[in-house]
Amino acid sequence: QRINTEKETLPKPIIWAKPSIMVTNGNSVNIWCQGAQSASEYQLYFEGSFFALERPKPSRSMNKVRFFISQMTSHTAGIYTCFYQSGELWSKSSNPLKLVVTGLYDTPNLWVYPRPEVTLGENVTFFCQLKTATSKFFLLKERGSNHIQNKYGNIQAEFPMGPVTRAHRGTYRCFGSYNDYAWSFPSEPVTLLITGGVENSSLAPTDPTSSLDYWEFDLSTNESGLQKDSAFWDHTTQN
């Protein structure tokens, strides 16, 4: 096990997850850690505890390894970091990778007020409701601006979008969370259509896929207690 020293002089590795940092309960996920070609061992930590290691074989590329989580559950959702060793030295920690498990317990309802098809500049609010009491709701937009909003609420949360622009058009889903890394099933998708303006923008996104494996997100919130943390949602974190 890695020993903390003041001489962690090797550059920090890059960590990312495939196919996504959002994983349906019971599905598998790969966590990649990329360090150096000279690395003799990689270690993966979960919530600060030693989780797994790999000693790459010389016949393979040694600058990165894949850690396989065969069945994602609420017990494997959370913050992952990795390190690598080269010679006697250990690297600094990678940036945190935050894995979320979805598909737990219940399915929320998502609807939009006043209606799914609105004119440019109209005020729009999304509502997410979950029968099971929860602490936080997340609203996700597929593709588009690739960001998440979250709101605290017991069984319902509202997401005021303000006067909509063409950038708001697209397909949305919401989740209820039981903690930051354990989320409900996704709601049914709601597609927001925007009409009016210079061009006819009422068309829905051309990509019909709704699989979470194809979604990429950044965390974006206006809650005072939470700060923007792009490392949470980027598949690759290396800043």
Epitope: S49, F51, A52, R55, P56, F67, F68, S70
Partner: nanobody
């Protein structure tokens, strides 16, 4: 579905040896990473040793040099050879598997394991 059955536990004197076996059902054993954990009375379950599907091993500091983990893919069995046993090794020993896995992954954290045996009791006393 994978089933794991441990055997080989028993009572032994300090300094003695035991070999635990864990037999796995199904054809997935060769693609599984395996591990041994133990739980002493009134304590939390702790990691003992693990082996990747390709045979790489890792040990808890408390058993390093005394315990050896190995596997026989032809027999779908993983072993834990325990020697120089001490009173503090007294515990229920559990075999666990990660199925499937990849490459040389060695899993140390119990949350990584998706299949568990029922355990076998090892008692070390004079």
């Amino acid at each position: 579905e994978v089933q794991l059955v441990e055997s080989g536990g028993g009572e032994v004197q300090p300094g003695g040896s035991l070999r635990l076996s864990c037999a796995a059902s199904g054809r997935t054993f060769a693609s599984a990473a395996m591990g041994w954990f133990r739980q002493a009375p009134g304590k939390e379950r702790e990691f003992v040793a693990a082996i990747s599907r390709s045979g790489d091993t890792y040990y808890a500091d408390s058993v390093k040099g005394r315990f050896t983990i190995s596997r026989d893919n032809a027999k779908n069995t993983v072993y834990l050879q325990m020697s120089s046993l001490r009173a503090e090794d007294t515990a229920v020993y559990y075999c666990a598997a990660v199925v499937p896995t990849y490459g040389n992954n060695i899993y140390v954290h119990s949350a990584a394991y998706n299949y568990w045996g029922q355990g076998t009791l090892v008692t070390v006393k004079p």
